[in-house]
Interface confidence: low
């Protein structure tokens, strides 16, 4: 009679996390008499998964009735599979012995791989804002997936990015894996409304990739441009000077007026006008009593934006010799002439 063979027909089985895995095993003979056991791994450190003879194995059920006469099918089903269950499973036949059963023959093994979905990608941007034309980095992380093969793409407003670096860890075999990618994005003035997207494709997602997003509005700072102009006034002894603060982001802005270097008024921008590109405009004005000045007045509009170093624009309000002599007899001879910024 031919010697008993232990047949594990599948070299590998792949199941999704949470499902049941069926591991098939068949014997070619009823002889020798003795139990079968299932192990994960080989050698001294192998883990007992199922013992036909004794023990409690709540997640394991046998596919057929093992006590049935002439049964040669020793397949098992393991419920609620997790990535930690991955490994090679061996069906082992033991020969009845005294005092202990003796290992007789092992199957070739079935490798169980577990398909686990990646977690939703988390995209994070730079800790500090940067100005247009600078490069900022965004990171994308996802964890807990298996198998290791995974595809990650970056997009900015629907356009694919190519300046990125992706690593999948660990490098060797593991029950599950993590992916970490860093993309470099060059900011432009129009990026307040822009978005970066990290897209992950994996076999478990069945063609429906996971996406994580980040808004460039959190990463960009668009510094303002300043323009100081004089508005026409009916009163001869007054000059109305405005400071137009344009195209800045984010909102936080404080403006200070100085007359000849002395603080005249400080205000915080409140009612802003939003531009189509997401940046803001704001205007402040200063009423100057020209008759109070015997000499030229240097007016400075100083703006501190988003905690950055102040920028300013200065203009000289020229008082003519005639005005200087006649004090309050100030006419329209007052003129606004630009000076170099302070």
């Amino acid at each position: 009679e031919d010697e008993l063979q232990v047949i594990q027909p599948e070299k590998s089985v792949s199941v999704a996390a949470g499902e049941s895995a069926t591991l098939r095993c068949a014997m070619t003979s009823l002889i020798p008499v003795g139990p079968i056991m299932w192990f994960r791994g080989a050698g001294a450190g192998r883990e007992l998964i199922y013992n036909q003879k004794e023990g409690h194995f709540p997640r394991v059920t046998t596919v057929s009735e093992l006590t049935k006469r002439n049964n040669l099918d020793f397949s098992i089903s393991i419920s609620n599979i997790t990535p930690a269950d991955a490994g090679t499973y061996y069906c082992v036949k033991f020969r009845k012995g005294s005092p202990d059963d003796v290992e007789f023959k092992s199957g070739a093994g079935t490798e169980l791989s577990v398909r686990a979905k990646p977690s939703a990608p988390v995209v994070s941007g730079p800790a500090v804002r940067a100005t247009p034309e600078h490069t900022v980095s965004f990171t994308c992380e996802s964890h807990g997936f298996s198998p290791r093969d995974i595809t990650l793409k970056w997009f900015k407003n629907g356009n694919e990015l190519s300046d990125f670096q992706t690593n999948v860890d660990p490098a060797g075999d593991s029950v599950s894996y993590s992916i970490h990618s860093t993309a470099r994005v060059v900011l432009t003035r129009g990026d307040v409304h822009s978005q970066v997207i990290c897209e992950i494709a994996h076999i478990t997602l069945q063609g429906d990739p996971l996406r994580g997003t980040a808004n460039l509005s959190e990463a960009i700072r668009v510094p303002p441009t300043l323009e100081v102009t004089q508005q026409p006034m009916r009163a001869e002894n007054q000059a109305n000077v405005t400071c137009q603060v344009s195209n800045f982001y984010p909102r936080g802005l404080q403006l200070t007026w100085l007359e000849n270097g002395n603080v005249s008024r400080t205000e915080t921008a409140s009612t802003l006008i939003e531009n189509k590109d997401g940046t803001y405009n704001w205007m402040s004005w200063l009423l100057v009593n020209t008759c109070a000045h015997r000499d030229d007045v240097v007016l400075t509009c100083q703006v501190e934006h988003d905690g950055q170093q102040a920028v300013s624009k200065s203009y000289a309000l020229e008082i003519s010799a005639h005005q200087k002599e006649h004090g309050s007899d100030i006419t329209h001879e007052a003129a606004l002439a630009p000076t170099a910024p302070l």
Partner: antibody, heavy 117, light 107 residues
Framework: DVQLQESGPGLVKPSQSLSLTCTVT?????????WHWIRHFPGNILEWMGY???????NYNPSLKSRISITHDTSKNHFFLRLNSVTAEDTATYYC??????????WGQGTLVTVSA | DIVMTQSPATLSVTPGDRVSLSCRAS??????LHWYHQKSHESPRLLIK???QSISGIPSRFSAGGSGSDFTLTINSVEPEDVGVYYC?????????FGGGTKLEIK
């Protein structure tokens, strides 16, 4: 413009190690991307061998894992291939390349390595 | 490993012809398929990435499509400098693998 140039011995004896250098100009390898080695066998067979990332993490083709090592020297803007225990089957044109994602954007001109006694 | 199969092995065409090259993956690779062109004694050059995305500097006569496991590269009007070997590459799963190439010849 990014350019890559392979260099190393054109003849290696069986059982010895094959060592090649890729010199990169026009881009600092410490700034980003993956840096790959790919070989071209006679008969139009291209094989991806492995890469090293800008940060020094390497990843290899499982078929070569026991024999291959890819390292870099960011100060010189070089990265290296070492393939141990070569046989005649390792005779090929070896290319270094810069990866854009899972593709190869820039390639070196290639260097022919013959394994023969 | 994912096996990439290209057909035909050789293609002989006349300048001005419209030609299609086929690439098949042994399993679904979504759209993670890239095309290269290698002229004699030159390095491969990236033509198309992610199945259909054009690369700057590549003539517009090159286009491509497909997803899953079947992909096609089309040359709208072949020119003499298009001779060489065309390779497809799996960019979906490591190890990245290449097809065996399609050699384009001019009659």
């Amino acid at each position: 413009d990014v350019q890559l140039q392979e260099s190393g011995p054109g003849l290696v004896k069986p059982s010895q190690s094959l060592s090649l250098t890729c010199t990169v100009t026009g881009f600092s390898i410490s700034r980003g991307y993956d840096w790959h080695w790919i070989r071209h066998f006679p008969g139009n067979i291209l094989e991806w061998m492995g890469y090293i990332t800008y940060s020094g993490i390497s990843n290899y083709n499982p078929s070569l894992k026991s024999r291959i090592s890819i390292t870099h020297d960011t100060s010189k803007n070089h990265f290296f291939l070492r393939l141990n225990s070569v046989t005649a089957e390792d005779t090929a044109t070896y290319y270094c390349a810069r990866g854009g994602g899972a593709w190869f954007t820039y390639w070196g001109q290639g260097t022919l390595v013959t394994v023969s006694a | 490993d994912i096996v990439m199969t290209q057909s035909p092995a050789t293609l002989s065409v006349t300048p001005g012809d419209r030609v299609s090259l086929s690439c098949r993956a042994s399993q679904s690779i979504s759209d993670s398929l890239h095309w290269y062109h290698q002229k004699s004694h030159e390095s491969p050059r990236l033509l198309i990435k992610y199945a259909s995305q054009s690369i700057s500097g590549i003539p517009s006569r090159f286009s491509a499509g497909g997803s899953g496991s079947d992909f096609t590269l089309t040359i709208n009007s072949v020119e003499p400098e298009d001779v060489g070997v065309y390779y497809c590459q799996n960019g979906h799963s490591l190890p990245w693998t290449f097809g065996g190439g399609t050699k384009l010849e001019i009659k």
